[in-house]
């Protein structure tokens, strides 16, 4: 079987625009270097949201200006995306690449539909 990547079908972002989900993969080999990428698919366009490479047993580190944070535990990655607005609602796909040692493997999940609802502004008090 090909490398399977599992992620939840639906996640609702918090009122502060934060969404978290788990991306889990079944590794066909003993990878020591793994790259995890979050892709967003909307209107058939796919864009990269964020990406991080980690060494097995080490922490997942995204770039400082990334909207993503995450932790890893074995073949499971806990991803958090911040700063989401209603317009960011869409399908967020987890892509896992086993980079080292060779051979390279690619696994792509079916995606997590993240719904973001902008909070209602507080009504003015009379």
């Amino acid at each position: 079987k090909a490398m399977h990547v599992a992620q939840p079908a639906v996640v609702l972002a918090s009122s502060r625009g934060i969404a978290s989900f788990v991306c889990e993969y079944a590794s066909p080999g003993k990878a020591t270097e793994v790259r995890v990428t979050v892709l967003r698919q909307a209107d058939s366009q796919v864009t990269e949201v964020c990406a991080a490479t980690y060494m097995m047993g080490n922490e997942l580190t995204f770039l400082d200006d990334s909207i993503c944070t995450g932790t890893s535990s074995g073949n499971q990655v806990n991803l958090t995306i911040q700063g989401l607005r209603a317009m960011d609602t869409g399908l967020y796909i987890c892509k896992v690449e086993l980079m080292y040692p060779p051979p390279y493997y690619l696994g792509i999940g079916n995606g997590t539909q993240i719904y973001v609802i902008d909070p209602e502004p507080c009504p003015d008090s009379d």
Partner: antibody, heavy 110, light 103 residues
Framework: VVQPGRSLRLSCAAS????????MHWVRQAPGKGLEWVAV????????YYADSVKGRFTISRDNSKNTLYLQMNSLRAEDTAVYYC?????????????WGQGTLVTVSS | TQSPSSLSASVGDRVTITCRAS??????LNWYQQKPGKAPRVLIY???SLQGGVPSRFSGSGSGIDCTLTISSLQPEDFATYYC?????????FGPGTRVDIE
């Protein structure tokens, strides 16, 4: 034309896209035969993978400041005779080749 | 393995080419067309996604190990050689090709 056992370096000058953002490949095709994937290099040059038939003899490299991809071919054999294509991997799936060069014929013969 | 290795067909025919993988990787399968003396061009990527600019008569499908390329109504410009290729694991191997000739 190059003699068996000798070396040759192929270059591929890319234009029309952000070269530094894309993985790049070499694919070859022997006369009258099918396509054979040769090697890939990641956008930043950090990772390289090779076909078993060229491992240890060929080296893929790139210069992002010059938008150029290279293939250093050492210890050439008659079976390396082929048209060599450079190709771009897509940003989402590096193994999908969406733009190809016109190819250059390499003939290894004494 | 890719089958058939060659086929003869007429304009307007429906043509199906199959690529059988050793594992369930159809989602990571691409299809290319190559005409004599020309570089290949990608038609279908990720099993069923049509590359921009490719006519809609080309379609890809498959799940598990059997992946297919279908040309719904063969046109004169479609006579060429077709290759499948997997992008799941290195080496990114190509199938041996299917030559589509005029009957």
């Amino acid at each position: 034309v190059v003699q068996p056992g000798r070396s040759l370096r192929l270059s591929c000058a890319a234009s029309g896209f952000t070269f530094s953002s894309c993985g790049m490949h070499w694919v070859r095709q022997a006369p009258g035969k099918g396509l054979e994937w040769v090697a890939v290099i990641w956008s930043d040059g950090s990772h390289k993978y090779y076909a078993d038939s060229v491992k240890g003899r060929f080296t893929i490299s790139r210069d992002n400041s010059k938008n150029t991809l290279y293939l250093q071919m050492n210890s050439l054999r008659a079976e390396d005779t082929a048209v060599y294509y450079c190709a771009r991997g897509t940003m989402i799936v590096v193994g999908t080749l969406d733009y190809w060069g016109q190819g250059t014929l390499v003939t290894v013969s004494s | 393995t890719q089958s058939p290795s060659s086929l003869s067909a007429s304009v307007g025919d429906r043509v199906t080419i199959t690529c059988r993988a050793s594992q369930s990787i159809c989602n990571y399968l691409n299809w290319y067309q190559q005409k004599p003396g020309k570089a290949p061009r990608v038609l279908i990527y990720a099993a069923s996604s049509l590359q921009g600019g490719v006519p809609s008569r080309f379609s890809g499908s498959g799940s598990g190990i059997d992946c297919t390329l279908t040309i719904s109504s063969l046109q004169p410009e479609d006579f060429a050689t077709y290759y499948c290729q997997q992008s799941y694991i290195t080496p990114f191997t190509f199938g041996p090709g299917t030559r589509v000739d005029i009957e």
